[in-house]
Structure formats: C-alpha cells, structure tokens
Amino acid sequence: RKIPKVGHTFFQKPESCPPVPGGSMKLDIGIINENQRVSMSRNIESRSTSPWNYTVTWDPNRYPSEVVQAQCRNLGCINAQGKEDISMNSVPIQQETLVVRRKHQGCSVSFQLEKVLVTVGCTCVTPVIHHVQ
Amino acid sequence: GITIPRNPGCPNSEDKNFPRTVMVNLNIHNRNTNTNPKRSSDYYNRSTSPWNLHRNEDPERYPSVIWEAKCRHLGCINADGNVDYHMNSVPIQQEILVLRREPPHCPNSFRLEKILVSVGCTCVTPIVHHVA
C-alpha cells in the first residue's frame, strides 16, 4: 500500500490534538534525543578501503544549520599494499534526512520541510562492466 | 537557536533564532525522491562489505519506513570471493531527523526527532591488539 502523506494517518484523531490551519502542520523543533552521540568505530573514514573526507555545509536559513557531507577520496579502492586499485570503485552511500527551511518573503517568514540527501561515507564495490556489442 | 540575517527594512521585533514551534507547509520539498535503497542502487550486494536491508516501520513517524543496514559478514570479501577476516566490515551510521507525531496519533502535529541509522557498510583495516 501507499505510504500516507505526512498529515494523514490510519488512526482516529484524538480530541487532544492542537488546532492547525488547513494546509499546514505544527512542528516542535525542540529535538527528541538531541544529545545522543554517534558511536561509530574510530576514524573509519581513514581506515576504510574506500576512504572519505568530510565537509561541513552551513546555511543560516536551514535548521539544523550545519550538515556534514562526505566525499570519497578516490575513484578506486585502496588495496592491501596501500595503493589505489582502479579495478574496484569507491562509491558514496547516501541517506535522506529532514531539515526545516526558513524562507523570507519581504518581511514575512514561512517555514518549509525539506528532504536533503546526505552522503554518509563510502564503500568499495565491484564495478558493473558494460561490454560494447 | 540559529541566527538568521534579517531584511534591514523589517521591524526589529523579528526573532533572529528559529522559534521553538513553527507552522510548516504540509508539502515537503523533494519528498518524491526514492526512499527504497534496494531500488536506488545495488551497492549493498556489490560491496566488499555487503549488507542486508531491514525494514523498520513506525506509523507514528515520518517517514514511516526506514531501511536499516546490517553488515552481512564480520570480514570483507576478497578478490577470490571469499570472506577474509584480515579486514573488517563495519556499519556506517548517520544521525537523521524525522518527524514524531506529538501528541501521539495526531495527524498534523509533529516534533523533530533525531535517530541513528546504519546506512551501509564499509571495509576497514582492523586495529589489532596482541596480548603482551
């Protein structure tokens, strides 16, 4: 079945729901689990056979303002000798996240939810080889 | 909060930070991008650190379906197609923001929630500790 739109649900609407103008929704941006920390293995971005670098993008009209993006360092993968092997490919792994975009129209301000595609890291894959007929 | 540059001609009462609660348009920008990683690429099968994708569904959350990656092996697949334990498959994790219905079951009232997801796996050189 289709995933329902954000504003729709299979549940009965409880009496306690706050009133919301049509075409919009109420969003509390006080983040649940704000202080949880990623416990990823130590410096895997450097130890990976498909290593990557991080860059921070900053946008004051976005919440959160900082979004970290990864970029694969190589086209190929690093072999046991520490050399780049171009018979394999380093490829980005991506994940969608939500952000709140603040838009200024004259002196009025509106807010829009936006899906952003974040590159999280890289993995080493066997290439798909296309043979010419 | 986050400081916002203001139009100099606007009244000074405008808050520079994002308010705690905002009304947002129901239409999500870029909402129709492909959210099924199995359809978007086959990296999970072609990787030297392949992973399985597990569907996590929660109707109280948007998006209601999130795919969790679990590394198939502890080692990595070598050039011979064998799993080699001299290298390690590890998950790549990412914090993402989702919407949580608050109060529960309410159709148009949400709160942002930060969740940790494993997106895929990568092959790393292990840190080996020998016993003295």
């Epitope: 130890r47 | 198939r72 502890l74």
Partner: antibody, heavy 120, light 111 residues
Framework: QVQLKESGPGLVAPSQSLSITCTIS????????VHWVRQPPGKGLEWLVV???????TYNSALKSRLSITRDNSKSQVFLKMNSLQTDDTAIYYC??????????????WGQGTPVTVSS | DVVMTQTPLSLPVSLGDQASISCRSS???????????LHWYLQKPGQSPKLLIY???NRFSGVPDRFSGSGSGTDFTLKISRVEAEDLGVYFC????????FGGGTKLEIK
Amino acid sequence: QVQLKESGPGLVAPSQSLSITCTISGFSLTSYGVHWVRQPPGKGLEWLVVIWSDGTTTYNSALKSRLSITRDNSKSQVFLKMNSLQTDDTAIYYCARDSTWDYYYTMDYWGQGTPVTVSS
Amino acid sequence: DVVMTQTPLSLPVSLGDQASISCRSSQSLVHSNGNTYLHWYLQKPGQSPKLLIYKVSNRFSGVPDRFSGSGSGTDFTLKISRVEAEDLGVYFCSQSTHVYTFGGGTKLEIK
C-alpha cells in the same frame, strides 16, 4: 524447527577423498550460513569451513588446500569435500548453522554429527 | 590464527556449587564494529555441542539463568551459579571476531 543432519561414508581409505552432505530444514540457505566442524575422538572442536548466506566462503587456512564447500539451495543441502585423508582426519564431522540473520555470528544449531574413520 | 586457552582442563564440583571457567584469547576479540564475538557451548556426553552464551554475556534461547558470561578484550569467564546434574559435560569457548577458533574445552564433572 531448525534441523541439520549429516550423512557420510563412515569409512574412508587413506589418501582417498571424503564427501559429506548436510541436509537442513526449518531455515533457508539464502538467509543463514552453514559451517563444518570436526572433533577427533576424545579431543576438542576444530572449525573447518563456512558457506555464507550469499554463497561466499571462508576456509580454515591450514586445511584450505584440501577442502571444498558447495551447496544446493533448492535441495537444502550443503556439501563438504576433503581430499587426501590421513588417519588423523578420523573424527566426528558436524555441520552447524551460523546465526547470520540474527547477527550473533556464531553457530546456533548443530547436527548430530557423522563419524568418519580413516583406515585401510 | 587466534589461540583460545581454557582453564581448568577439568573442574570437579558438587551439585549446587558455583562453577567458574576461564577463557583467554591471544588477541583482543573486540571487532572494529565495537562488538565482542566470544561464545560458550556445552557438549554433553554423546551429544553435539549446544550454544549457551553468545557475544560474551547473552543467553541463547532456552538457556537457564544460572548460566552467565562476562569479560572483555582477551579475558572471559563462564559462571554456573548452582550446578545441576544436567550441566555436566565439556564446555568450549569460541570466538568469531577473527576466523573461527575454539578453546580446548573444560570438563565439568562430579566431585
């Protein structure tokens, strides 16, 4: 429920090869790995080889040149072939399921074992 | 390969006593993903091994809570709080962080 059953020749002549079959039920070979482990009489356990859910394999490096593991998903069977047997290969040979899908990475269910004697 | 050393080789106990078995590895068993893949099995006479504990301290389904596992890095312990007759047999530790290896076994027997 999960079951594994080994079947083998029982007796093998020195320098000959050994073929053993593990027939499984209650799970799928495309979701779980299968290991072979052996136990010489009165001794401990020695891990031999595993075939993973995706068909990849890992071998005991000391025995790799003598071992081969294959499977037939449609028949729910895993096959072990071992070449150049000597008397010290006499053991009970077990197949065991790897808890791959639960991500414990250990052998959670074992067959009852098949005894193999290497003797002329 | 990683060498697993179990002590003692033989452990005579009285029923109702606590038993403790040690297992030491030649390398750390902490995987790059942060988990430790150290497991315990019991092999009763004439039977195949049965999984008791996985990943150091997690009891496998159906295993009584008198069995507990602990340890980290290279040193691990299996404890049986009150030994029962059905607990007798050979206990093996095993690791799967590196390519699979087993300890030599500890025989739990009646004093």
